[in-house]
């Protein structure tokens, strides 16, 4: 039975040209995390595999940095980076947990972090 929950940074905003950390945290389970995928709806950004380490998609190599931890840092943000991002935790024996983050990249300097929220 899947007992865990994914906590994410929720809805966040950042300035064009700046950087942002996408972060998820899996709690309330003793399951072993074997792999974490970071994806958009149709594009894999990065994979952190317990055995193989980090893999960054070539399309994002110049402006995606692994970490901190199992998170992902997006750099040199553009307005086109606005949208949904997903962290997918592959665990044993629980299975797969998914968290969603919505990033809005703003032209102005009024970007603020949104509130944290939980996805069961």
């Amino acid at each position: 039975m899947m007992t865990g929950t994914i906590e994410t940074t929720g809805n966040i905003s950042a300035e064009k040209g700046g950087s942002i950390i996408l972060q998820c945290h899996l709690s309330s389970t003793t399951a072993q995390v074997t792999q974490v995928n970071w994806e958009q709806q149709d594009q894999l950004l990065a994979i952190c595999n317990a055995d193989l380490g980090w893999h960054i998609s070539p399309s994002f190599k110049d402006r995606v940095a692994p970490g901190p931890g199992l998170g992902l840092t997006l750099q040199s943000l553009t307005v086109n980076d606005t949208g949904e991002y997903f962290c997918i935790y592959h665990t044993y024996p629980d299975g797969t947990y998914t968290g969603r983050i919505f990033l809005e990249v703003l032209e102005s300097s009024v970007a603020e972090h949104g509130a944290r929220f939980q996805i069961p």
């Epitope: 792999q35 995928n37 994806e39 709806q41 149709d42 594009q43 894999l44 994979i47 595999n49 193989l52 893999h55 998609s57 399309s59 997903f86 997918i88 592959h90 797969t96 998914t98």
Partner: antibody
């Protein structure tokens, strides 16, 4: 339980258009992308494209741009694919499927056979 | 586009045998590969995702392995009901592409 119910087989004339439907149930329609695949007899699977019902965004395989148009109706939880200017090369079974991020396409429709013949 | 190549179009095996189907990607796709089973007249069914993770309800005789460009799908003890075509698919980037399929025939 999750189900994707596709419309019935179609027999259409060359040059005509056809619109196939894929009605989903058992989950929130706007949570996942709906993908469309083509399979010709005794051949493999080709990915046509997807629609994300939440915002209506689409992405197409270049090969099918201009041939296929994907739409979705949130009120009826139904995805559609229109194929136009049909030729014999378009005769195939077309599948819709739900994709879960990082997990492949986990639920598929039963397939809709399209036959183009005069 | 990423090309997925399944070198064997057909494989013949006996009930109880171990069989492995290989798939090669034209570029590094990390572990973003799924395997599907399609029986005659049916829709494909997801068996394995992210190269090695068994989908819910899939019997444990089905396993997947590999990363980068080389992937393997294995049935540890073939059953009569495993007669089907097996496809690999990369879910690394669009356009998602499938291998040509390997038809498993039971002797």
């Amino acid at each position: 339980q999750v189900q994707l119910q596709q419309s019935d087989a179609e027999l259409v004339k060359p040059g005509a258009s056809v619109k196939i439907s894929c009605k989903v149930s058992g989950y929130t329609f706007t949570d996942h992308t709906i993908h469309w695949m083509k399979q010709r007899p005794e051949q493999g699977l080709e990915w046509i494209g997807y629609i994300y019902p939440r915002d209506g965004s689409t992405k197409y395989n270049e090969k099918f741009k201009g041939k296929a148009t994907l739409t979705a109706d949130k009120s009826s939880s139904t995805a559609y694919m229109q194929l136009n200017s049909l030729t014999s090369e378009d005769s195939a079974v077309y599948f819709c499927a739900r994709r879960v991020v990082a997990s492949g396409m986990d639920y598929w429709g039963q397939g809709t056979s399209v036959t183009v013949s005069s | 586009d990423i090309v997925m190549t399944q070198s064997h179009k057909f494989m013949s095996t006996s009930v109880g045998d171990r069989v492995s189907i290989t798939c090669k990607a034209s570029q590094d796709v990390s572990t973003a590969v799924a395997w599907y089973q399609q029986k005659p007249g049916q829709s494909p069914k997801l068996l394995i995702y992210s190269a090695s993770y068994r989908y819910t309800g899939v019997p444990d005789r089905f396993t997947g392995s590999g990363s980068g460009t080389d992937f393997t799908f294995t049935i540890s003890s073939v059953q009569a009901e495993d007669l089907a075509v097996y496809y690999c698919q990369q879910h690394y980037s669009t356009p998602y592409t499938f291998g040509g399929g390997t038809k498993l025939e039971i002797k």
